[in-house]
């Protein structure tokens, strides 16, 4: 039967219909920066070209004996996971390997940098189709390695990296912490985060998604027909590199931002048991397991959004945290969160010609996070409208007054240390959907966007009795762009988007009375783009055989059905 | 990439009159910074990536590398340029004593310097 990991990333309808995943990825070249590889292994023979690039340090220890099979082990297995004939994700992808890790699996930042430069120069000398670079390695946080990854990504290369196997915050490692890189954590057959000895997969806001990374069957360098099971975030990253190759082969014009959004969109949601992660990391870690899209048809019309968390601000009174979207994305809303509840809200502000989301800590607070909602909205023209704190008791309000602009998000920011909970909450008057409302002592910021065919609506879910969490979700066909709490009083810890659901967190019930002061309303702004839907329909009408859909249906195989285990 | 900017010795002589090479000091208010791996066992002292400001050309990178070598030699320190970066980031990889970091940070065009460190298969 099909290995569990390939079953897990295969869309359900193809498992049910017993279709083989496509010999996809044929238009894509995947660069692997790893150990040496056994290029004549049956799984990868003819699929992997070994470049002459080698930059590795001397092995440690005087009694170290180089054994070819050990030297090639890691890289051979990963090449097999990406493009192996039998156990590979993207069986049509061609690969190029660069040796940056020695026989002990150790390399240097400088060697990796020179390797990335080699790829860039190769790309300039001989431009090919889409490029994916797989970095199944990790070191400590490195400004220069992250910068090199950023430059390569901005040159149109998709970089996929291992989150790291240190059971730690991935933001402390590179290249995992580089925002432009797609960072992958590892899960097992039970959708649990992978444990590796006393350690395990990294986690946190720098992880983009998880993928199968335990007990992965792949090419073994022990012999040219051998297979072996390996585990780690490298294996998880190899799955995502394979999926990326498939997606890019079906849609070669996809940008990095579009690819990342699609990877997130087509992932299995909320299947990971978060109890494995440290408590303070659970909210920051994406509960996503990578999967192939069922089809590229129907993807184009979607308004894709993702949530980007900032680094923690730190506890000083005036500390702030900033969350940023990728260059090709639009910041459609901005929210904030503080575990202590002591915060002074958030606002969208221009920085280097682009909007960013800034959250403000308050006196006595342990720090805040800024949470950006980053979306793909072609031809968008977005601006922020601000209303200063109101004198009137009705609260502060601001709306989108420009013709054709719709409200995509609301933020509020206050200078006072504590918005009193004794003041009655202010609910937005009905029939005014393009309006943000907030506490009278807060300034309110409305994100207003004009884009072809963009339409948005506001959804609220209010709970009169105090509750630790209030949620409201957008329905099928609509995408969550904004998430905020009404009215944003001090017992509200903050608001953030999880997939298509707006989550508002409040202080522990035991610390809040059951009076009306405990009332919390979660406000979701849900949008869709009629323009994208039309463009997608036109595209489907004028093209044939270009989607993953068609590739999937090209070849049948007797695969036994395996059901996706959701916990 | 080979060195295209004239004889190394010429540069040594040209720098004789300069006080520690500060004739072309960094622009006012912009101080180059030094970074190293937070995980001590992963550090590789003695090898440094000198990253230059974004718009620095290859010839300027090579010139800056030679300037560092010349100034280091005048203090009795050896330096070896292992690579000159261009294409992704401007800069160079150098083997040198950590004693030279203060000097290197004052070189023109330098944005930051990072000590080399280990990476591992995951």
């Amino acid at each position: 039967s099909i290995p569990w990991n390939l079953e897990r990333i295969t869309p359900p309808r193809y498992r049910a219909d017993e279709y083989q995943p496509p010999d996809g990825g044929s238009l894509v070249e995947v660069y692997l920066l790893d150990t040496s590889i056994q290029s004549d292994h049956r799984e990868i023979e003819g699929r992997v070209m070994v470049t002459d690039f080698e930059n590795v340090p001397e092995e440690d220890g005087t009694r170290f004996h180089r054994q070819a099979s050990k030297c090639d082990s890691h890289g051979t297995h990963l090449a097999g996971v990406v493009s192996g004939r039998d156990a590979g994700v993207a069986k049509g992808a061609s690969m190029r390997s660069l040796r940056v890790l020695n026989c002990q699996g150790k390399g240097t930042v400088s060697g990796t940098l020179i390797g990335l430069e080699f790829i860039r120069k190769s790309q300039l000398v001989q431009p090919v189709g889409p490029l994916v670079v797989l970095l199944p390695l990790a070191g400590g946080y490195s400004r220069v390695l992250n910068a090199a990854c950023q430059r390569l990504a901005r040159a149109g290369v998709v970089l996929v990296t291992a989150a790291g196997n240190f059971r730690d915050d991935a933001c402390l490692y590179s290249p995992a912490s580089a925002p432009e890189v797609i960072t992958v954590g590892a899960t097992n057959a039970q959708d649990q985060p992978v444990t590796l000895g006393t350690l395990g997969t990294n986690f946190g806001r720098c992880v983009d998604l998880f993928a199968p990374g335990e007990d992965i069957i792949g090419a073994s360098s022990d012999c040219s027909t051998c297979f072996v099971s390996q585990s780690g975030t490298s294996q998880a990253a190899a799955h995502v590199a394979g999926i990326a190759a498939m997606m890019l082969s079906a849609e070669p014009e996809l940008t990095l931002a579009e690819l990342r959004q699609r990877l997130i969109h087509f992932s299995a949601k909320d299947v990971i048991n978060e109890a494995w992660f440290p408590e303070d990391q659970r909210v920051l870690t994406p509960n996503l397991v990578a999967a192939l899209p069922p089809s590229t048809h129907g993807a184009g019309w979607q308004l894709f959004c993702r949530t980007v968390w900032s680094a923690h601000s730190g506890p000083t009174r005036m500390a702030t945290a900033v969350a940023r979207c990728a260059p090709d994305e639009e910041l459609l809303s901005c929210s904030s969160f503080s575990r202590s509840g002591k915060r002074r809200g958030e606002r969208m502000e221009a920085q280097g010609g682009k909007l960013v989301c800034r959250a403000h800590n308050a006196f006595g607070g342990e720090g805040v996070y800024a949470i950006a909602r980053c979306c793909l909205l072609p031809q968008a023209n977005c601006s922020v409208h601000t209303a200063p704190p109101a004198e009137a008791s009705m609260g502060t309000r601001v709306h989108c007054h420009q013709q054709g602009h719709v409200l995509t998000g609301c933020s509020s920011h206050w200078e006072v240390e504590d918005l009193g909970t004794h003041k009655p909450p202010v609910l937005r008057p009905r029939g005014q959907p393009n309006q943000c409302v907030g506490h009278r002592e807060a300034s309110i910021h409305a994100s207003c966007c004009h884009a072809p065919g963009l339409e948005c609506k506001v959804k609220e879910h209010g709970i009169p009795a105090p509750q630790e969490q209030v949620t409201v979700a957008c329905e099928e066909g609509w995408t969550l762009t904004g998430c905020s709490a009404l009215p944003g009083t001090s017992h509200v810890l903050g608001a953030y988007a999880v997939d298509n659901t707006c989550v508002v967190r409040s202080r522990d019930v035991s610390t809040t009375g059951s009076t009306s002061e405990g009332a919390v309303t979660a406000v979701a702004i849900c949008c869709r783009s009629r323009h994208l839907a039309q463009a997608s329909q036109e595209l489907q009408g004028s093209t044939s055989g270009s989607g993953l859909n068609d590739i999937f249906e090209a070849q049948k195989i007797e695969w036994h059905e395996h059901h996706h285990h959701h916990h | 990439q080979e060195d295209e900017d004239g004889d190394y010795e010429e540069l040594v002589l040209a720098l004789r009159s300069e006080e520690d090479g500060l004739a072309e000091a960094p622009e006012h208010g912009t101080t180059a910074t030094f970074h190293r791996c937070a995980k001590d066992p992963w550090r590789l002292p003695g090898t440094y990536v000198v990253v230059l400001k974004e718009e620095t050309h290859l010839s300027q990178s090579e010139r800056t590398a030679r300037r560092l070598q010349a100034q280091a030699a005048r203090r009795g320190y050896l330096t070896k340029i292992l690579h000159v970066f261009h294409g992704l980031l401007p800069g160079f990889l150098v083997k040198m004593s950590g004693d030279l970091l203060e000097l290197a940070l004052k070189l023109p065009h330098v944005d930051y310097i990072e000590e080399d460190s280990s990476v591992f298969a995951q």
């Epitope: 060697g111 | 030699a73 009795g76 050896l78 292992l82 690579h83 083997k95 040198m96």
Partner: antibody, heavy 121, light 107 residues
């Protein structure tokens, strides 16, 4: 054990080119720079330049800058030195040497056996 | 280029003699000097690095000293296998120049 093995003797005509190889074994080839030094008959040693095999970065003695090319092939742990537009005074033994680097001192700790290049019409 | 002037260019000595070879740099090279021994038809072998550090496996009768511009290689008690040519090298700046060599012959 660590060693550098060079290609055999060459006889060349003036104006021709010669390519000398230096095969490394017993250590990680990309971990050390390889230098080329020549010695004319009965004369002293003359440094020609070096290559960093891990990045192909090269640095040459100005005297040879326009005529010398240094390359490497990591798959066979071999460095090459090519000297073009040969003249009779290029007749010499050409050595490759591995450079060992410590914190603030370095030296050539391993040398090839030498390759005799004779330039004669 | 830095010129390394080695003297004498040749000397005759007997087994057991103390032999001193000097090298003078045309400019300050601090302690960036190495000494090599070369026998006829063979490649050079490292003896001393950084002016005064004896390389692994080199007999203790070989010692180096000096800094700046003046350097000395001393063989405290000449042995039969020490009859060879000795070269100094500066690594302070490129090109990494060598001395002209000192040939030590049997008296």
């Amino acid at each position: 054990q660590v060693q550098l093995v060079q290609s055999g003797a060459e006889v060349k005509k003036p104006g021709a080119s010669v390519k000398v190889s230096c095969k490394a074994s017993g250590y990680t080839f990309t971990g050390y720079t390889i230098h080329w030094v020549r010695q004319a008959p009965g004369q002293g040693l003359e440094w020609m330049g070096y290559i960093n095999p891990s990045s192909t970065y090269t640095k040459f003695n100005q005297k040879f800058k326009d005529r010398v090319t240094m390359t490497r092939d990591t798959s066979i742990s071999t460095a090459y030195m090519e000297l073009s537009r040969l003249r009779s005074d290029d007749t010499a033994v050409y050595y490759c040497a591995r450079e060992r680097i410590y914190s603030n001192y370095w030296f050539f700790d391993v040398w090839g056996q030498g390759t005799t290049v004779t330039v004669s019409s | 280029d830095i010129v390394m002037t080695q003297s004498p260019s040749s000397l005759s000595a007997s087994v057991g003699d103390r032999v001193t070879i000097t090298c003078k740099a045309s400019q300050n090279v601090y302690t960036a000097v190495a000494w090599y021994q070369q026998k006829p038809g063979k490649s050079p072998k490292l003896l001393i690095y950084s002016a005064s550090n004896r390389y692994t496996g080199v007999p203790s009768r070989f010692s180096g000293s000096g800094s700046g511009t003046d350097f000395t290689l001393t063989i405290s008690s000449l042995q039969p296998e020490d009859f060879a040519t000795y070269f100094c090298q500066q690594l302070s700046s490129q090109p990494e120049t060598f001395g002209g060599g000192t040939k030590v012959e049997i008296k």
